[in-house]
Interface confidence: low
């Protein structure tokens, strides 16, 4: 077969297909460039358009910034001339790649600009509690689009020791199942570490005052987190799933995890934080169902049921 010389492959037409795009969540920091990625294939050659919050967005028109638009692609980088320029560009972006056969659309890319994090100034009243009772010291870090790390320390920058009795929750709060007079300190300080901005900020110190009693009263377990009897969660396939139960009581309750709907996937489950956290690596369809935590001590038990629905990522 002889193919005429004038025949070229580009006569075969292909509708656009997005081949590369930024992640759905993108966090930028005050000094970072903003880079949004959108690549697509197609014949005739694909052309690109962006929207921000549903409105036509033209990077090349933005004032006070330098824009580099990659040739033959929808990707662009914006470089600012001041430390806070990223705030201007927060929003939900979408890339459209089109040729005459049609249009392909990227997923929504939520661009979040993190400013320099600050804890609101507040007057922290001393927390007064009787020996043997439970208490929660709140952290409440400023909102952050990026994952941040929480540490509880004292004024000597020593970590607060955690065990079955004293636990930091996923939310950053410090939970005491029951307090001892040895917990009496005026300097419980919550530190928030923002890796992206390489910033550590600290909350005003909390003064925990423990009043001694002659006899500590035994109490059966009660869940401090979650506080209700059941909750429903959606887990994404292939993503990790973290379930948490923190209980109070005296003696200190122990936590057990059960799966009424079937065996616990032992090869993919880890227990952390003195059994208070169950982490399931790479969720699959078979992980759908009920997970139950049981807090027990010599006086009784408390439970929470997590109903997990697994969805495609």
């Amino acid at each position: 077969i002889q193919i005429p010389e004038e025949y070229e492959g580009h006569h075969v037409m292909e509708p656009p297909v997005i081949t590369e795009q930024s992640p759905r969540r993108l966090v930028v920091f005050p000094t970072d460039d903003i880079s949004l990625k959108c690549e697509a294939s197609g014949k005739p050659e694909v052309q690109f358009r962006w929207t921000r919050d549903g409105v036509h967005f033209k990077p090349k028109e933005e004032l006070g910034v330098t824009v580099y638009q990659s040739p033959h692609s929808g990707s662009f980088t914006i470089t600012g001339n001041n430390s806070n320029f990223a705030q201007r560009f927060q929003g939900i972006y979408r890339c459209f790649a089109s040729n005459k056969l049609g249009t392909a659309m990227s997923h929504e890319i939520r661009l979040m600009a993190e400013g320099a994090p600050k804890w609101p100034k507040e007057t922290v009243k001393p927390v007064e509690v009787e020996e043997g009772e439970s208490v929660v010291l709140p952290c409440n870090p400023p909102p952050s689009a990026e994952p941040l790390r929480i540490y509880w320390m004292n004024s000597k920058i020593l970590h607060i020791k955690q065990d079955e009795r004293v636990t930091m929750g996923q939310n950053g709060n410090l939970y005491f199942a029951n307090v001892l007079t040895s917990d009496n300190h005026s300097d419980y300080i919550c530190h928030a570490h923002f890796p992206g901005t390489r910033t550590i900020i600290q909350k005003e110190p909390i003064d925990l005052r423990v009043k001694a009693t002659n006899s500590m009263i035994d109490r059966k377990p009660r869940l401090l987190f979650p506080t209700n009897s059941s909750s429903h969660l959606v887990a994404l396939q292939g993503q990790p799933l973290v379930l948490e139960c923190i209980a109070e009581g005296f003696p200190t309750p122990t936590i057990k995890w059960l799966r009424p709907s079937g065996p616990m996937p032992a090869d993919r489950v880890t227990y952390q934080n003195h059994n208070k956290t169950l982490q399931l690596l790479k969720v699959g369809e078979e992980d759908d169902g009920e997970y139950r935590c049981l807090a027990e001590n010599s006086l009784g038990s408390a439970r929470h049921a997590y109903y997990v629905t697994v969805e495609a990522a």
Epitope: E45, Q47, R49, P71, T103
Partner: antibody, heavy 118, light 113 residues
């Protein structure tokens, strides 16, 4: 800001050729197709064709295939349209227009009036 | 080629009035896979280049006053000016970019009484 600069009027003789230019600035020249549009005096708009500055690829309106040749010079961010065998019918304003992805022409040059007259 | 037909060819209205103009295409401009209509509206004031007002039949170009709106789907489209201002005196063209060659309507001329 984006600018498409076209030269002023051109007076040419019937049968001759003319090469119109469109100098682009304020954006990445190779990232967007350049359109060319004809408007005869008191008439509507006609699409002549388009060129991709990054690789020189063109799409023409069949009506103009034997009349217009589109080209670019990336080194000076300029698009060109050569019109040949000119007749009175070619007397018109010729616009270059930038399109940034959906063919809608969102930046236009100010147009060059070509007058074909002996 | 897709033929674009605009009506009326001209209209005269008073300032503050609502205006609608029509554009019909000989083939559907709706691309089923993304439900977008590949139609744009342009405004051309006397002695000036055309200016993009609307794309995708109903999406206002950034910087265009919200008194301009586009509607319609398939083959029938409308440009509406909710409250005409004197500065809106111009020719208005629709254009399809669904298929090559891209084609324009013959225009609607808007005048003020």
């Amino acid at each position: 800001q984006v600018q498409l600069v076209q030269p002023g009027d051109e007076l040419v003789k019937p049968g001759a050729s003319v090469k119109l230019s469109c100098k682009a600035s304020g954006y990445t020249f190779t990232s967007y197709w350049m359109q060319w549009v004809k408007q005869r005096p008191g008439q509507g708009l006609e699409w002549i064709g388009e060129i991709n500055p990054s690789n020189g690829r063109t799409n023409y309106n069949e009506m103009f295939k034997s009349k217009a040749v589109l080209s670019v010079d990336k080194s000076v961010s300029t698009a060109y349209m050569q019109l040949s065998s000119l007749t009175a019918e070619d007397t018109a304003v010729y616009y270059c227009a930038l399109y940034d992805g959906y063919y809608a022409m969102d930046y236009w040059g100010q147009g060059t009036l070509v007058t074909v007259s002996s | 080629d897709i033929v674009m037909t605009q009506s009326p060819s001209s209209l005269a209205v008073s300032v503050g009035e609502r205006v609608t103009m029509s554009c019909k295409s000989s083939q559907s401009l709706l691309y089923s896979s993304n439900q977008k209509n590949y139609l744009a509206w342009y405004q051309q004031k006397p002695g000036q280049s055309p200016k993009l007002l609307i794309y995708w039949a109903s999406t206002r170009e950034s910087g265009v006053p919200d008194r301009f709106s586009g509607s319609g789907s398939g083959t029938d489209f409308t440009l509406t000016i909710s409250s005409v201002k004197a500065e809106d005196v111009a020719l208005y063209y629709c254009q399809q970019y669904h298929s090559y060659p891209f084609t324009f309507g013959q225009g609607t001329k808007l005048e003020i009484k």
